[in-house]
Interface confidence: low
Amino acid sequence: TPWSLARPQGSCSLEGVEIKGGSFRLLQEGQALEYVCPSGFYPYPVQTRTCRSTGSWSTLKTQDQKTVRKAECRAIHCPRPHDFENGEYWPRSPYYNVSDEISFHCYDGYTLRGSANRTCQVNGRWSGQTAICDNGAGYCSNPGIPIGTRKVGSQYRLEDSVTYHCSRGLTLRGSQRRTCQEGGSWSGTEPSCQDSFMYDTPQEVAEAFLSSLTETIEGVDAEDGHGPGEQQKRKIVLDPSGSMNIYLVLDGSDSIGASNFTGAKKCLVNLIEKVASYGVKPRYGLVTYATYPKIWVKVSEADSSNADWVTKQLNEINYEDHKLKSGTNTKKALQAVYSMMSWPDDVPPEGWNRTRHVIILMTDGLHNMGGDPITVIDEIRDLLYIGKDRKNPREDYLDVYVFGVGPLVNQVNINALASKKDNEQHVFKVKDMENLEDVFYQMIDESQSLSLCGMVWEHRKGTDYHKQPWQAKISVIRPSKGHESCMGAVVSEYFVLTAAHCFTVDDKEHSIKVSVGGEKRDLEIEVVLFHPNYNINGKKEAGIPEFYDYDVALIKLKNKLKYGQTIRPICLPCTEGTTRALRLPPTTTCQQQKEELLPAQDIKALFVSEEEKKLTRKEVYIKNGDKKGSCERDAQYAPGYDKVKDISEVVTPRFLCTGGVSPYADPNTCRGDSGGPLIVHKRSRFIQVGVISWGVVDVCKNQKRQKQVPAHARDFHINLFQVLPWLKEKLQDEDLGFL
């Protein structure tokens, strides 16, 4: 909140403030205004104006300080490349309009990195990555010249530096100076030149924050070897002993506004939820501030690692809490964080140097009192011994993310506060916090938390198998009889769970093909283990041609699976992994898990089906309440079951029933879906409750899933809670921690 904004309400007239081709809206009870233009246009010459003490609006000045009489909306242009080394770009033009494209080409002997073709986007930024022509002659790879910046320095040996500058009127985001480091990476982060009208889209923010706040839950060493021209993948270690402190710092000053404050709270709630879904427990600190900071949660509090409790505290914070003292003292807020980090009597506790600290600051960057907050960041770095020892700079132990919210964001201020790390972005400018909410839940990259069950890489760039990493495709080749296709689920490094009816006793291991992670190669099978009570011919004498009770099998693989982003286990009921996934207390019993996952009601669930070579999630409802009986009775419409007197002869207590039209019209399974998991999605994790066994109606004749299906089209799945003793016995060496 700049001092000039703190004036009595309505002291500036609105006469003549209109903008040609757009509109304006008042901020801060009439003490500021923001010009709003249609998509593809920006307000010229300024985006915001402030009401001065003289009772007049701040003048309309261009970047070169010329005064303009009337504001207007002008078409957004993307900046042109000032320099492009060792190659050419085409077409060359003094400016580029939205949707214009440019192409980059390298001279002989140079190789192009980044994007060869880039498009001018509606927000004034070029799509893709900085194009760089490099001959690999440097110790570090060429750091490139992001479009719109100018680079000084063209030597890329160890300890060489390059500096970047922006044209007048543009603000540099990222690192102005970068140094070639041992190992071939550049210090800092790639710079860019920002115009005041430029915002990060929710997708950009999600993606950049997502890939930066990467963590390995298993506690992999953060120092990765890598060479020139390669980006080092930095990993923040979130280990179960809670060696990470996350400080949530929320600006509650006048200039932020109530709606952005509420939006920011929602985003942080999502962030806490997402972190908690890993089964790890970082400690949280929670600070809001205006003229003074208010600490709501201290990292030293016993409950600071209890995600639900921290969320409750966050939800209870009111924007009005800072109303009477509504300046913006970011320095004091960060000092509150510093106080939480420091230790009594200056005696560092055991393990202080293994604790990683993440500060997430949501502000408009307009500190107007208390002095420059950057000094506190320096003090924090000092306290944590960061950047002092060249051999061990410990940069991984502090991350400062700054989210600039709203039109008054001071880009210089927020850039100064944020961390600068190679190939990462720590500073974001968002137009309106609410449009972030839908993507904020994505913002932690689970790509390294590999052995956690039921974990999914929810990312827009993710493939089918990033989104269903447990899914296995099974086919059985039978000479002269064609082949059978089924699905299965990875449940451990050596086992895939599927349906027994996918196989016959005559099937040899070598004729069974299993693939996971979307990989082309088939896995070698050691053995298929059937449930001992499965016998498809068990009731033939009673006139039941096929009997699917206990229709489950485990495929044991010869070689251990290598978990990765596209290959991960699903959670099984009554395991410790599921207890953690559901964030239940460690003392949780199997029965309590069952009540959580299969309550006596309609239960939202899903299965995964392959359609036109794509895996898709199908949402269904398990009828486990008052609709259960009618669901099971519809089994009589299945071919061969029409003569069955008592339906419980075929629908045993081992089955779960889905399908039908109530409460919603459920999609049905197809033949090729057999053996796949029936899944309950809870708390951002996926828990298998059933194995797809059989259906009443073949809704997929001629390879096409029929849209119109009868109400009696039901599907039956083996309830895993009913085959637990067998699972426990067969998977006893798999470290799943059965309860």
Partner: antibody, heavy 120, light 113 residues
Framework: EVQLVQSGAEVKKPGASVKVSCKAS????????MTWVRQAPGQGLEWMGW????????KYAQKFQGRVTMTRDTSISTAYMELSRLRSDDTAVYYC?????????????WGQGTLVTVSS | DIVMTQSPDSLAVSLGERATINCKSS????????????LAWYQQKPGQPPKLLIY???TRESGVPDRFSGSGSGTDFTLTISSLQAEDVAVYYC?????????FGQGTKLEIK
């Protein structure tokens, strides 16, 4: 203890190819570039190029471009250097070497060398 | 490519005496911004791979006796053995890493007089 163990001596005819292996132990193979240097009999040392075992990315000296191929098998922590279209002046001892850091230019660890003799 | 020229080609020095080997580069190896020289010295004994002695022109590798020292800047560099020992008989190479390709000198053979 860091160790680089190379394959045994080879005798090749001109025009043929040779593939020398270098098995690493005592450290994380994928964390450090593997560099290849050769030394003709009674001559000096000559840098041939490097491979990044993590990504498989390579950088070759211009002199060997088109004739040299560096590969690796991370499952057995082994780097390979294949030189094709051999000539008599390719007779040399071929060394693999590793620096202190991921891509350090200072070669602190060396293999014992593999003598390749090219003779008709 | 940067050419490295060592002198002399061979050198005979009495035990306990000082040995000096020179290395000249065809262009400066000094990074004026960091004041570092991109040069290393290696020792190679018969039938053995080379051994790193000095890097950054003057930084002694750990475990290397302090009788070995490196000096020089820009294009002219020197390796000095202050008091020659019998085990120092070897060929010594300088190497530049200022630019790719990294290049070595032709070597200097050090013998005992």
């Amino acid at each position: 203890e860091v160790q680089l163990v190379q394959s045994g001596a080879e005798v090749k005819k001109p025009g043929a190819s040779v593939k020398v292996s270098c098995k690493a132990s005592g450290y994380s193979f994928t964390d450090y570039y593997m560099t290849w240097v050769r030394q003709a009999p009674g001559q000096g040392l000559e840098w041939m190029g490097w491979i990044n075992p993590n990504s498989g990315g390579t950088k070759y000296a211009q002199k060997f471009q088109g004739r040299v191929t560096m590969t690796r098998d991370t499952s057995i922590s082994t780097a390979y250097m294949e030189l094709s279209r051999l000539r008599s002046d390719d007779t040399a001892v071929y060394y693999c070497a590793r620096g202190y850091y991921a891509n350090s230019a200072w070669f602190a660890y060396w293999g014992q060398g593999t003598l390749v003799t090219v003779s008709s | 490519d940067i050419v490295m020229t060592q002198s002399p080609d061979s050198l005979a020095v009495s035990l306990g005496e000082r040995a000096t080997i020179n290395c000249k580069s065809s262009q400066s190896l000094l990074n004026s911004r960091t004041s570092k020289n991109y040069l290393a010295w290696y020792q190679q004994k018969p039938g053995q791979p080379p051994k790193l002695l000095i890097y950054w022109a003057s930084t002694r590798e750990s475990g290397v006796p302090d009788r070995f020292s490196g000096s020089g800047s820009g294009t002219d560099f020197t390796l000095t053995i202050s008091s020659l020992q019998a085990e120092d008989v070897a060929v010594y190479y300088c190497k530049q890493v200022y630019n790719l390709p990294w290049t070595f000198g032709q070597g200097t053979k050090l013998e005992i007089k």
